[in-house]
């Protein structure tokens, strides 16, 4: 099983130092500052899963260091960011999405030794992010709808 | 196989400085996400967690004992060193170095999954 | 810092017997809690991380439970190598903490 921690107030001060291995801001529907580091040195685990999220801003994640797995399952996600995806020891738990094409080109060219990535569909079923890729975005598809939700269901 | 083995000087006075080495194999404190803690037990008593040294360099202490403590590490001879200075019987205790590994499969845990044998140290004067 | 209290604090149990230990945390820390078997003169082992996976090769009649406060060390069918202090340690938080132990007599 996965760790896990309690969720955390719906009122956020983005400024305030978290001092947590862990942390559950899940189903808050928040929206992450643009032009601040969340301050969590020792996070290791943060949970940003169910919040409306169509965008990661790298900013937001540039201090979190020790940080092992981020998981933003549920969010529209309509890019994820290339320095974040550059991140080859952060274990990124998301949807399948065609927006995680991005995602995977950047670890397949820049991360070596890499265990497969993963995708969860609406039954929150693993898939194997590429098998995904192949079979549900064509070609520039995820840039031309927007927010690229193709799930592939099984 | 993973190991680790403390080593220190045995016996003390106090006010002295006690430095501790854990030296171990099977694994590099260079990895993303490896680490090295030290947890002390005194003789019939529960384990105290002490510091600890992420791969990066960043350190980790008690606070309690904060300024008297010392953490480093030597990477590429697999060793991590822990100073510990003023000591007092209250230190008098079995030194253990434990490996905090990355789980790359189901990670964001935090655990101890190899520990060393443990040093004795007693401060007497 | 958060305090972790075991109990019992010592027990004496028959082989073949079923053995709760237990370990409440001062607040919440989640499923962030290992528990340690240590014997005389040995150093600890691992057991059980994030409150209930087995450790590997640990026996199946070792099985942990519980998350936010109250933790739960079950061990069915107890063996006489299982004669040990059990501790229970917490890593959601630094400074990291541990129970004070729990120590198990076979009759």
């Known amino acids: 099983l996965e760790p896990s921690c309690t969720v955390s107030s719906a009122d956020v001060d983005w400024n305030a130092e978290f001092s947590a291995t862990c942390l559950n801001f899940s189903g808050l529907s928040l929206s992450l500052p643009h032009n601040q580091s969340l301050r969590a040195s020792n996070v290791i685990l943060l949970d940003l899963s169910g919040n409306g999220l169509r965008e990661l801003p790298v900013t937001f994640f540039a201090h979190l260091q020790k940080l092992e797995v981020l998981n933003v399952l549920r969010n529209p996600l309509s890019r994820v960011d290339g320095a974040l995806a550059a991140r080859c020891d952060l274990d990124l738990q998301a949807d399948c999405n065609c927006a995680l094409e991005s995602w995977h080109d950047i670890r397949r060219d820049n991360c070596s030794g890499q265990k497969p990535l993963l995708c969860w569909d609406t039954t929150s079923s693993q898939h194997n992010l590429s098998a995904f890729l192949e079979v549900s975005c064509a070609p520039g598809l995820a840039s031309a709808t927007g927010s690229g939700h193709h799930h592939h269901h099984h | 196989q993973v190991t680790l083995k403390e080593s220190g000087p045995g016996i003390l006075q106090p006010s002295q400085t006690l430095s501790l080495t854990c030296s171990f194999s099977g694994f590099s404190l260079s990895t993303s996400g490896m680490g090295v803690s030290w947890i002390r037990q005194p003789s019939g008593k529960g384990l105290e967690w002490l510091a600890h040294?992420?791969?990066?360099?960043?350190?980790r202490y008690n606070p309690s004992l904060k300024s008297r403590l010392t953490l480093s590490k030597d990477t590429s001879s697999n060793q991590v060193f822990l100073k510990i200075t003023s000591v007092d019987t209250a230190d008098t205790a079995t030194y253990y170095c434990?490996?905090?590994?990355?789980?790359?499969?189901?990670?964001?845990?935090?655990?101890?999954?190899?520990w060393g044998a443990g040093t004795t140290v007693t401060v007497s004067s | 810092d958060i305090v972790m209290t075991q109990s019992p604090k010592s027990m004496s149990m028959s082989v073949g017997e079923r053995v709760t230990l237990t370990c409440k945390a001062s607040e919440n820390v989640g499923t962030y809690v290992s528990w340690y078997q240590q014997k005389a003169e040995q150093s600890p082992k691992l057991l059980i991380y994030g409150a209930s996976n087995r450790y590997t090769g640990v026996p199946d009649r070792f099985t942990g439970s519980g998350s936010a406060t109250d933790f739960t060390l079950t061990i069915s069918n107890v063996q006489t190598e299982d004669l040990a202090d059990y501790h229970c340690g917490q890593s959601y938080s630094y400074p990291f903490t541990f129970g004070s132990g729990t120590k198990l007599e076979i009759k």
């Open positions: 040294i992420y791969w990066d360099d960043d350190k």
């Open positions: 434990a490996r905090r590994p990355r789980d790359y499969y189901g990670g964001g845990h935090w655990y101890f999954d190899v």
